[in-house]
Amino acid sequence: EPHSLRYNLTVLSWDGSVQSGFLAEVHLDGQPFLRYDRQKCRAKPQGQWAEDVLGNKTWDRETRDLTGNGKDLRMTLAHIKDQKEGLHSLQEIRVCEIHEDNSTRSSQHFYYDGELFLSQNVETEEWTVPQSSRAQTLAMNVRNFLKEDAMKTKTHYHAMHADCLQELRRYLESSVVLRRRVPPMVNVTRSEASEGNITVTCRASSFYPRNITLTWRQDGVSLSHDTQQWGDVLPDGNGTYQTWVATRICQGEEQRFTCYMEHSGNHSTHPVPSGKVLVLQSHWQHHHHHHGLNDIFEAQKIEWHE
């Protein structure tokens, strides 16, 4: 998977009046990494692992970047002409990626009230607009404003892309990101499905990096893809990931099935709990994390695009 840095900024308005603050989160390799703390007026790391990435360096550069971007986005929202009465949001998502072959990609997306209306591939300088008439109007409105702003030239976007990649490379220099390995905790549960059948679920949690193999095996052989159901690999808010896989088996045949997990060159197998036992937890060198994600968008009542 490529390394990525994603900036997620939102500004709000009420009856056309744009609020003076902004909401911002930055994700590094898909993990919550920074957020802008309005009360402290600066970018703050999300949890211990994010603090470790920069060590004792300050977050002044990140604060400056987010503040500047927030100001730009507020100005953009103020120039959206068709603002109706009530609460509205303008969200900008900027992503830059470095792939294994050292190639780079960068994109930018704008959402109004949760609806995507404008995207840009920075390398190709190609803008994309969805077909809806609302998106077309909004996109024209915003693009005209961006063109009027001398800063929003091609060089501006390329500089923004270069800055994003420079930041990403700076973070990747940290051994915390490149060499970080947190083994998963694997957890097998069973539940009655229908007469004679049970559903067995294997959950892996608190692991890093994201890549993991989790599959059910019968007599040591992996089950076919269509007999298993997989959950997405999702951030758990602690700088680590979680996922699951489930399958349906005949009651009484539990001992033939194991959950196979492979992560960062290590692997383990986990049996189905038998009889009345509902949960078997296999603590596989599990490292505990106590840094929960403080979700600043909880109270915002606006659609939030990951």
């Epitope: 009420w14 009856d15 744009v18 003076s20 703390d37 309005r38 402290k40 007026c41 109270a299």
Partner: antibody, heavy 116, light 107 residues
Framework: EVQLEESGPGLVKPSQSLSLTCTVT?????????WNWIRQFPGNKLEWMGY???????NYNPSLKSRISITRDTSKNQFFLQLNSVITEDTATYYC?????????WGQGTTLTVSS | DIVLTQTTSYLSVSLGGRVTIACKAS??????LAWYQQKPGNAPRLLIS???SLETGVPSRFSGSGSGKDYTLSITSLQTEDVATYYC?????????FGGGTKLEIK
């Protein structure tokens, strides 16, 4: 523990300038947060006047913009309020407080009377 | 500027009783509201931020609620030390403004 303390002249004549100092202990004003001036009029109405952020940027209440200036001395961990051309209606208790949105630490306040 | 209106200037409540203090904003403020308690001769003290988040050290008999334009501070089981004036303050956009205050007395 974070502590803020205001100091000032107590009495100022109309049309003169008012200068107040807020001394912060237990926290560096260059670390983070915004550092605010808030006043409370004799009828108890509270008014936010403006702030200087940890980075040195300022934000003022538009109703005072032409008369107000907030500065700081980082070596002494102090920030200052200057209000020009004062009038009797500027008579109030002046507070300094910490916060970029709401105010979690306040000074005890200093009373200022504008009178000839 | 956003105007915060605390319609009740004075409230007289019995000890042990329940109090609700209202604050209405002239615009939607997205829960960006704080509540303060001020006792005579003292500076205001922060009780609640983000409309509902109780500050450390504030007794759990205090709570905040509301959304959009309408917000409420509630005090259950009123104590003598709760006699004070209560102010709301928004931080949707600058200039930040305060409500006019609600003075709470014991009946």
């Amino acid at each position: 523990e974070v502590q803020l303390e205001e100091s000032g002249p107590g009495l100022v004549k109309p049309s003169q300038s008012l200068s107040l100092t807020c001394t912060v202990t237990g926290y560096s004003i260059t670390s983070d947060y915004a550092w605010n001036w808030i006043r409370q009029f004799p009828g108890n109405k509270l008014e936010w006047m403006g702030y200087i952020s940890y980075s040195g940027s300022t934000n003022y209440n538009p109703s005072l913009k032409s008369r107000i200036s907030i500065t700081r001395d980082t070596s002494k961990n102090q920030f200052f309020l200057q209000l020009n051309s004062v009038i009797t209606e500027d008579t109030a208790t002046y507070y300094c407080a910490r916060g970029g949105t709401y105010f979690d630490y306040w000074g005890q306040g200093t009373t200022l009377t504008v009178s000839s | 500027d956003i105007v915060l209106t605390q319609t009740t200037s004075y409230l007289s409540v019995s000890l042990g009783g329940r109090v609700t203090i209202a604050c209405k904003a002239s615009a939607h403020i997205n829960n960006w509201l704080a509540w303060y308690q001020q006792k005579p001769g003292n500076a205001p003290r922060l009780l609640i931020s983000d409309a509902t988040s109780l500050e450390t050290g504030v007794p759990s008999r205090f709570s905040g609620s509301g959304s959009g334009k309408d917000y409420t501070l509630s005090i259950t089981s009123l104590q003598t030390e709760d006699v004070a004036t209560y102010y709301c303050q928004h931080y949707w956009s600058t200039p930040w403004t305060f409500g006019g205050g609600t003075k709470l007395e014991i009946k």
